[in-house]
Interface confidence: low
C-alpha cells in the first residue's frame, strides 16, 4: 500500500461511511441481529485529555491492537452468519465489506509504520495498560463499535501520524 494513502482523509471517510451504513441497516433488524454469543471488541471511548497526555507509542498500541481485535470479531461474526439461517443474507454483504475494509486499513496502517511504533521503544509496551475491551452480542453493536473506532482512535492516530509525516 502507498505509504501515505491513509493520510488522504477521503480514504478513511469511505470506510467510516461503509461502517455507518452497516450500523444503520442492522439497527433495523430484530433485536439488533443477535450473534448468539459475546464477542470481545475494543472499547472505543476516548478520553481526550488522557489521549493527549499519553505516549504516541501508546496510541499506536491502542490502534494496532484495536484493529486486530476488531478484525477477529468481524471474522467471528462472518463465521456465525454463515452458520445461521435466521439472519438476512444482505447482512453478509456488510460483514464481508467490513472484513475486507479492516484488512485494507491494517495494510494502510502498516505502510504508515504503526506496527513499528506500537512495539518500539520497548518500555512503551511494557508500561502500557492492557487494551480496554467490551462485549458485543449483536451485529448492530459490533458495527457501532467498528464505526466509532474508525471515527475515534483511528482518525485521531492517523491525524497525528500524518501531520508529523511519520511512516
Amino acid at each position: 500500500a502507498p505509504a501515505r494513502l491513509i493520510c488522504d482523509s477521503r480514504v478513511l471517510e469511505r470506510y467510516i461511511l461503509e461502517a455507518k451504513e452497516a450500523e444503520n441497516v442492522t439497527m433495523g433488524c430484530a433485536e439488533g441481529c443477535s450473534l448468539g454469543e459475546n464477542i470481545t471488541v475494543p472499547d472505543t471511548k476516548v478520553n481526550f485529555h488522557h489521549w493527549k497526555k499519553s505516549e504516541a507509542g501508546r496510541h499506536a498500541v491502542e490502534v494496532w491492537q484495536g484493529l486486530a481485535l476488531l478484525s477477529e470479531a468481524m471474522l467471528r461474526s462472518q463465521a456465525l452468519l454463515a452458520n445461521s439461517s435466521q439472519l438476512p443474507e444482505t447482512l453478509q454483504v456488510h460483514v464481508d465489506k467490513a472484513v475486507s475494509g479492516l484488512r485494507s486499513l491494517t495494510s494502510l496502517l502498516r505502510a504508515l509504520g504503526v506496527q513499528k511504533e506500537a512495539v518500539s521503544p520497548p518500555e512503551a509496551a511494557s508500561s502500557a495498560a492492557p487494551l480496554r475491551t467490551v462485549a458485543a452480542d449483536t451485529l448492530c453493536k459490533l458495527f457501532r463499535i467498528y464505526s466509532n473506532f474508525l471515527r475515534g482512535k483511528l482518525k485521531l492516530y492517523t491525524g497525528e501520524a500524518c501531520r508529523r509525516g511519520d511512516r
Partner: antibody
C-alpha cells in the same frame, strides 16, 4: 553517545542565502526528527522548523515559511537548514537539536543539541 | 499560536531553593520541558515531560505542572546553576514547538 556536529561560522551579505549542516553520529539517524532552533544575540530560543528523516516531511514555523528549507540526507546522516533572503536580524547562532522518544508528538523532547553555528549577516 | 510566559529573572542565595515559573493557557494539557543554557553554550535538557529528569541531571532539579503554571524547582542552589532557563511545549494545534522567553537565574553572593 549521540553527537551532532555542525558546520562552521559564516559571514553573509544581506539578500544572500546560508546553508548550515548538522551531522549526526550515534543512534539511528532516521529514527528521530531534527529541529533547528536559532538564538539572536542576547535573545531567547526560537524554533524554526524540523524534519522527520524517514519521510522527508519538514514543517516550519510561520515566521520562516517561504524563507527556510530543511532537508536531510540519510546516506550521510546529515540534516541541513537553508535560510534565504538574509537580513541583519538573521544574525544569530543556529542550533540543530535531535528529538528523542516520539518525533513530532507531545512526547517528543529535544534531547541532543549541536554546539551551534554563528551566522553573521552584514554588508 | 501558543504563548509561554516566563519571568525575565530570578535571584536566589546559594543553598536556597529557586523556583522558575512558566505560564500558558491550560498548560497542564501539555508536556513541559526545561532547558538550561550557560553563556556561550548550547541548551541542555534538565527536565522533560513535566517532571522527569534525564540521566546525569542532579536530583536537585525537579518539575511540576498544574493550574496555569509549570514550575522548575532547583533546591540547594549552587553557583554553577547560574544560567538561562527555558520552558518548552509542543503545541499540537499548530504542530510546532514553542519556547518561553527564558529566565535568567542569578545566584547571589
Amino acid at each position: 553517545q549521540v553527537q551532532l556536529v555542525q558546520s562552521g561560522a559564516e559571514v553573509k551579505k544581506p539578500g544572500s542565502s546560508v546553508k548550515v549542516s548538522c551531522k549526526a553520529s550515534g543512534g539511528t539517524f532516521r529514527s528521530y526528527a531534527i529541529s533547528w532552533v536559532r538564538q539572536a544575540p542576547g535573545q531567547g530560543l526560537e524554533w524554526m522548523g524540523g524534519i522527520d528523516p524517514i519521510s522527508g516531511f519538514a514543517d516550519y514555523a510561520q515566521k520562516f515559511q517561504g524563507r527556510v528549507t530543511i532537508t536531510a540526507d540519510e546516506s550521510t546522516s546529515t540534516a541541513y537548514m537553508e535560510l534565504s533572503s538574509l537580513r541583519s536580524e538573521d544574525t544569530a547562532v543556529y542550533y540543530c537539536a535531535r528529538e528523542l522518544y516520539y518525533p513530532g508528538t507531545w512526547m517528543a523532547v529535544m534531547a541532543y543539541w549541536g554546539r551551534g553555528t554563528l551566522v553573521t549577516v552584514s554588508s | 499560536s501558543y504563548v509561554l510566559t516566563q519571568p525575565p529573572s530570578v535571584s536566589v542565595a546559594p543553598g536556597k531553593t529557586a523556583r522558575i515559573t512558566c505560564s500558558g493557557d491550560n498548560i497542564p494539557e501539555y508536556y513541559v520541558h526545561w532547558y538550561q543554557q550557560k553563556p556561550g553554550q548550547a541548551p541542555v535538557l534538565v527536565i522533560y515531560r513535566d517532571n522527569e529528569r534525564p540521566s546525569g541531571i542532579p536530583e536537585r532539579f525537579s518539575g511540576s505542572n498544574s493550574g496555569n503554571t509549570a514550575t522548575l524547582t532547583i533546591s540547594r542552589v549552587e553557583a554553577g546553576d547560574e544560567a538561562d532557563y527555558y520552558c518548552q511545549v509542543f503545541d499540537e494545534s499548530s504542530w510546532h514547538w514553542v519556547f518561553g522567553g527564558g529566565t535568567k537565574l542569578t545566584v547571589l553572593g
